[in-house]
């Protein structure tokens, strides 16, 4: 037999299918020009010493073979003895290791069998009513096709599915969408209405994420506030990566899960922008303010479930950093300025009340004064911190107030509002005899003592009504009792108590008269 012809003799090997799992498969035969044809196949298994034979049976029942040697592709003309206008049955027999392995048969009319391409180029993936929709441009001159898909997950083998007939410039397919696992899809096409025509090769993998992006499983810590008034949010545990099917491992466009960090600064509500979204990889520095944080996972089908946290405000206070002067026109605060052209946010809220009741004021960008201080003033009419109670004050600073992650804490402290010197006056001053020349003076704690760091000391004043001599006794802010000694019996005294802050002298309490009775011996 000539090599270019189909040989109508018995093949040079025994006719027995070994039934082994390896062997030839995916036989495709089609016309490649007006008079030439090609068949190609794949061989699974060790290829050393394998000889392939393309077998062909005509409708008359006569059969022939082409010897392909070790090649898995063979071309022949319409003069090779194979009928191209009538239906023929073709298969491959591979002779290896003294056994024959056979491919599945294909039955087709060769002249009308055109080589079809799989979907080429960009395959668009979208979600439609809980299913996956794939769409692609029909390859040139190949309108009219049957389309199949196969799909697998990381833990399941290939499953075959049908897209149905296609007859347009764009083709599409509805496929199952998995809720929680990624899938790999491949598509193939063949000529529509051409009985027995060969399937194209499988397309490149199309990698599809699950409908629900994986829940972020991250862990955060926040560092302590540094000297610059900022603290770093640190990621202790990265989100778990999505498991991918075999063909999607490595570069798998389409299955990416994006994790975003959403920051909401709860403190200083009068600033322009309260929320910022960042990539999770870029861990921000935060001020000492309170924040709510969310990590949002999303894929090409949209967002998934959030993971949320609250970062409490850093309440470390600096009792000496803030100077407050109260004048007839109003009140002015002074604190060490941060830098040139800084915007400050001054926030205050009554102590012991819900964080939602904080009030704040935003300054215009300001430079330090000659003493290196920044200031904020308000009038009595504004009502700011006007009630006689303890306020917690925090001052934040930023050169770029529109950028949420560039705020820093300047200081946090306590301040007693209103007329502190009068409101802080101790009440219920009482005097009890202690010994023959001493008394114990007690008083109720000043309202200023409810404000950490505000009450500097108590001063107890004792006045001898006879000699008009006055003595003053400083008392620690944690004490509400003092013993006055060296007193003389029968002399009238008055005692008063006041409460002082670092910058304000208190108002004396009402004078309390007392005397030590003269002891008469029997």
């Amino acid at each position: 037999c000539r090599t270019s012809e189909c040989c109508f003799q018995d093949p040079p090997y025994p006719d027995a299918d070994s039934g082994s799992a390896s062997g030839p498969r995916d036989l495709r035969c089609y016309r490649i020009s007006s008079d030439r044809y090609e068949c190609s196949w794949q061989y699974e298994g060790p290829t050393a010493g394998v000889s392939h034979f393309l077998r062909c049976c005509l409708s008359s029942g006569r059969c022939c073979y082409f010897a392909a040697g070790s090649a898995t592709r063979l071309q022949f003309s319409d003069q090779a003895g194979v009928s191209v206008l009538y239906t023929v049955t073709l298969w491959v027999e591979s002779w290896a290791r003294n056994q024959t392995e056979k491919s599945p048969e294909v039955t087709l009319q060769l002249y009308n069998s055109v080589k079809y391409e799989p979907p080429l180029g960009d395959i668009k993936v979208s979600k439609l009513a809980g299913q996956l929709r794939m769409e692609w441009e029909t390859p040139d001159n190949q309108v009219g096709a049957e389309v199949q898909f196969r799909h697998r997950t990381p833990s399941s083998p290939w499953k075959l599915g049908d897209c149905g007939p296609q007859d347009d410039d764009t083709e599409s397919c509805l496929c199952p969408l998995e809720m929680n696992v990624a899938q790999e899809f491949q598509l193939r096409r063949r000529q529509l209405g051409s009985q027995g025509s060969s399937w194209s090769k499988w397309s490149s993998p199309v990698c599809v994420p699950p409908e629900n992006p994986p829940q972020p499983q991250v862990r955060f810590s926040v560092e302590q506030l540094g000297q610059d008034g900022r603290r770093r949010l640190t990621l202790k545990e990265q989100p778990t990566q999505l498991e991918l099917p075999e063909g999607c491992q490595g570069l798998a466009p389409g299955t990416e899960v994006t994790y975003r960090l959403q920051l909401h600064m709860l403190s200083c509500p009068c600033k322009a922008k309260a929320t910022r979204t960042l990539h999770l990889g870029k861990m921000p520095y935060l001020s000492g303010a309170a924040y709510n944080v969310a990590v949002i996972s999303s894929n090409q089908f949209g967002p998934g479930l959030n993971q949320t946290w609250h970062i409490p405000a850093d309440t470390h206070t600096e009792p000496v950093a803030l100077n407050i002067s109260v004048g007839t026109n109003g009140t002015t605060m002074y604190w060490p300025a941060r830098a040139q052209s800084m915007t400050y946010c001054i926030e205050w809220q009554p102590v012991g009340q819900d964080g939602g009741l904080a009030t704040c004021s935003l300054t215009a960008p300001q430079d330090p004064d000659p003493a290196g201080m920044a200031t904020y003033s308000w009038s009595r009419e504004s009502g700011a911190m006007g009630q006689e109670k303890c306020y917690y004050i925090t001052i934040f600073a930023s050169a770029h107030p529109e950028k949420l992650t560039l705020w820093s804490t300047v200081l946090s402290t306590y301040h007693f509002g209103g007329n502190a010197s009068a409101a802080g006056t101790p009440h219920h001053v009482s005097v009890k005899n202690h010994s023959l020349d001493s008394v114990s003076v007690d008083w109720a704690p000043s309202l200023l003592s409810t404000c950490p760091g505000v009450l500097k000391e108590y001063v107890v004043r004792c006045r001898d009504e006879d000699s008009k001599q006055v003595s003053e006794h400083p008392v620690q802010p944690t004490e509400t009792q003092v013993t006055l000694s060296g007193l003389r019996a029968g002399v009238a005294y008055t005692v008063q108590v006041r409460a002082d802050t670092a910058w304000l002298r208190g108002v004396w309490s009402q004078p309390q008269r007392f005397s030590i009775e003269v002891q008469v011996s029997d």
């Epitope: 829940q215 862990r219 810590s221 603290r231 609250h310």
Partner: nanobody, 124 residues
Amino acid sequence: QVQLVESGGGLVQAGGSLRLSCAASGGPFSGYVMGWFRQVSGKEREFVAGITGISSTYFADSVKGRFTISRDNAKNMVYLQMNSLKPEDTAVYYCAAVNSFGVIPTSPNGMDYWGKGTLVTVEP
């Protein structure tokens, strides 16, 4: 491995009070952020209150002003004081922990360790 055991649940009339306790063992307790979550049958577990190692606290809006959370690091205990209870507070209350500094998880997947829960029933 941290073990958490809740106690203090029970039946109470609306407007009444309960104090839940959570005993922790098996870890450096002060390094853990502790939280209370609750779950009504068939619904997601929801955040109630949380407390950091240095006792900064945070509460769900629905319980703010009624519930307080506290901890005793020496005794490895966390407490949830529940006042002015309402029928909608009826749930299984879970104590949870995560080894973290200064960040209170407000979604259940932010916690690493859980107790078995204690049932709180508030009758109208």
